[in-house]
């Protein structure tokens, strides 16, 4: 009896793992077996497919074969009993294509109201990712043990902290890389929980804000409690898409180590240009606290997106704002030629309700005031374009009162 | 292990313009800070310049209007060009990593430049 | 720019002996400061930054110290892979600069 070709052979990548799978064309033919050539582009002969020859099962594994990913290669099996099928031609493939993303290692620790993920692609030192190791970014989905309720965090590094959680709380959570180059999206690692450590004395510095001043940067921060020291440290940002980076290390920064104020001045001059992450802790001799939340730091913009600078008309029932460009020390205003948005907080100023404008206009009428009421203003500028993605230091609050009614005119 | 690896024609003659080769191995030019420092005879030693990851350049002022740093990262290379080199550029010529402040962690192992008519 | 003044220009001290390397700085540097080691053809060595902070790998018989515009580097125990010269550099301010070395020779 003539063998039959076996049929709907699939390909299956996953990093540097070649599975094949296909279906018998005869399952009533006992003790057959199966075997496989490939061919590379711009060649006329086949060869045999090591790993992948007189196998008895419906799946084998070519991952040995050291192949060009990047290169098309096309595939042929048969069956063999006594005699031999005819081959059966496989569509041809480039495996760099076909590649699905596996599921990423996953790290895990826990902070009292945070948790650190360290994450890693699966397959070490793979070769299908060997030029796009520094373009995979994460996503993944998180949850509260107790609720199910996800959260879903899209664009993450290797390195990275979710912050605002709970104490003495487990949390669950899962990974997925992607190619966004490549439009690759993995699959997800599998899943991972943690409990959030009980709360910490001392809680982290908060609210960090980097402002220019006379060629320096003033780094500055709140905290609840008096009598602390301060310790500010540094990490330039690309390195947190380097998972294997053995340069990864947060540095002091001399002006910033011990401070007994919650700021500090370092000259803008000690940082090379680039993006760098800051983070700060309080100390009381005995405790420390964990560290805040880094911040974004853009040498470049940094030194050039400084907070607007504005006047008020005050009406009874309104307040037109006149927003001009800022002023650099010796008063003369900053060109900023790149378009900004202003966000405009303000509040009566015996309460705590702020209330919120985005305008891209440099004149904007703060609306629905009551008269004869003191108003506070703040403002600061944000960068249009996606790519720079900057905003300024909020200015100095501005209090004015309204003025008496029927003089909205 | 981050590895520099400076090469160049070791003697060149007043006037001229001196190329060096910087090759990188171990790590890759598009992370971090790439700097030129030499050092004199008397061992006086000197700041170039540096190129970053993203491109971005400085130049020591005293060598602003003669100096050039560029680079090709599919090679994994950074250079150094100077113009118009004079007895005085006579120098063992290194380059150098930083991480974003300016102290160097890897250095090569330097390459000697003679000017000589 | 700011100048770097180090001291002494050379020393000559016995395997086991301490050392301490002075740098003066003519502006406060803020221990924006670091020290390399370099051996005779050799590339330099970072060894200190920050003023005090050891680089990785660096023996603990080496630390730095100072503030302000005074700054040292100590050597306590010397060891024979330890001599050669040393050079400090602040960065503090661009364009950074060197201290023109202490050559540390066996007596």
């Known amino acids: 009896k003539n063998l039959k070709s076996p049929q709907k052979v699939e390909v299956d990548i996953i990093d540097d793992n070649f599975i094949l799978r296909w279906n018998r064309s005869d399952e009533s033919v006992g003790n057959v077996t199966f075997s496989f050539d490939y061919q590379k582009t711009g060649m006329d002969n086949w060869i045999k497919l090591s790993g992948c020859q007189n196998i008895t099962s419906t799946k084998c594994n070519f991952s040995s074969l050291k192949l060009n990913v990047y290169e098309e290669i096309k595939l042929r099996i048969r069956a063999e009993k006594e005699n031999t099928s005819s081959w059966y031609e496989v569509d041809s493939f480039t495996p760099f294509r076909k590649a699905q993303i596996g599921p990423p290692e996953v790290h895990l620790e826990a902070e009292d109201k945070a948790i650190v993920i360290h994450i890693s692609p699966g397959t070490k030192d793979s070769v299908m990712w060997a030029l796009d190791g520094l373009s995979f970014t994460y996503s993944l989905v998180i949850w509260k043990n107790s609720s199910g309720v996800e959260e879903r965090i899209e664009n993450i590094y290797s390195r990275h902290k979710i912050y605002k959680l709970s104490p003495e709380t487990t949390y669950c959570l899962k990974v997925k890389a992607a190619l966004l180059t490549s439009w690759k999206i993995g699959v997800y690692s599998p899943v991972h929980c943690i409990k959030t450590t009980v709360e910490n004395e001392l809680p982290p510095p908060e609210n960090i804000e980097v402002s220019v001043q006379n060629q320096n940067y003033v780094l500055k921060w709140d905290y609840t409690y008096a009598n602390m020291t301060f310790q500010v440290q540094w990490l330039h940002a690309f390195l947190k898409r380097n998972p294997g980076n053995h340069l990864y290390k947060w540095k002091q920064i001399p002006d910033c180590e011990n401070v007994k104020t919650t700021q500090c001045v370092f000259p803008q001059n000690v940082f090379q240009k680039g993006i760098y992450l800051l983070r700060v802790q309080a100390s009381d001799g005995n405790n420390t606290s964990f560290w805040s939340e880094e911040i974004k730091f853009d040498t470049e913009i940094q030194a050039f997106l400084l907070p607007p600078v504005f006047n008020i008309r005050s009406l009874s029932d309104s307040f037109h704002i006149y927003i001009g460009a800022p002023k650099q020390s010796g008063n003369t205003p900053v060109i900023q030629d790149y378009p900004l948005i202003y966000e405009i907080i303000f509040w009566e100023n015996t309460s705590n309700a702020e209330r919120k404008i985005i305008e891209k206009k440099t004149d904007v009428t703060v609306p629905n005031l009551k008269p004869l009421t003191v108003y506070c203003v703040k403002a600061r500028a944000h960068t249009m374009d996606e790519k720079l993605n900057k905003s300024s230091v909020f200015s100095d609050a501005v209090c004015e009162k309204t003025k008496p009614g029927n003089t909205s005119k | 292990e981050v590895q520099l690896q400076e090469s160049g024609p070791g003697l060149a003659k007043p006037s001229q313009t001196l190329s060096l080769t910087c090759s990188v191995t171990?790590?890759?030019?598009?992370?971090?800070?790439w700097n030129w420092i030499r050092k004199f005879p008397g061992n006086k030693l000197e700041y170039m310049g540096y190129?970053?990851?993203?491109?971005?350049?400085y130049y020591n002022p005293s060598l602003k209007s003669r100096i050039s740093i560029t680079r090709d990262t599919s090679k994994n290379q950074y250079y150094l060009q100077l113009n118009s080199v004079t007895n005085e550029d006579t120098a063992t010529y290194y380059c150098?990593?930083?991480?974003?402040?300016?102290?160097?962690?890897?250095w090569g192992q330097g390459t000697t430049l003679t000017v000589s008519s | 720019d700011i100048q770097m003044t180090q001291s002494p220009a050379s020393l000559s001290a016995s395997v086991g002996e301490t050392v301490t390397i002075t740098c003066r700085a003519s502006?406060?540097?803020?221990?924006?400061l670091a020290w390399y080691q370099q051996k005779q053809g050799k590339s330099p060595q970072l060894l200190v930054y920050n003023a005090k902070t050891l680089e990785d790998g660096v023996p603990s018989r080496f630390s730095g110290s100072g503030s302000g515009t005074q700054y040292s580097l100590k050597i306590n125990s010397l060891q024979p892979e330890d001599f050669g010269s040393y050079y400090c550099q602040h960065f503090w301010s661009i364009p950074p600069t060197f201290g023109s070395g202490t050559k540390l020779e066996i007596k």
């Open positions: 190129i970053s990851y993203s491109g971005t350049i």
């Open positions: 150098a990593r930083s991480g974003g402040m300016y102290y160097f962690d890897y």
């Open positions: 171990g790590y890759s030019i598009t992370s971090d800070y």
């Open positions: 502006g406060n540097i803020h221990n924006y």
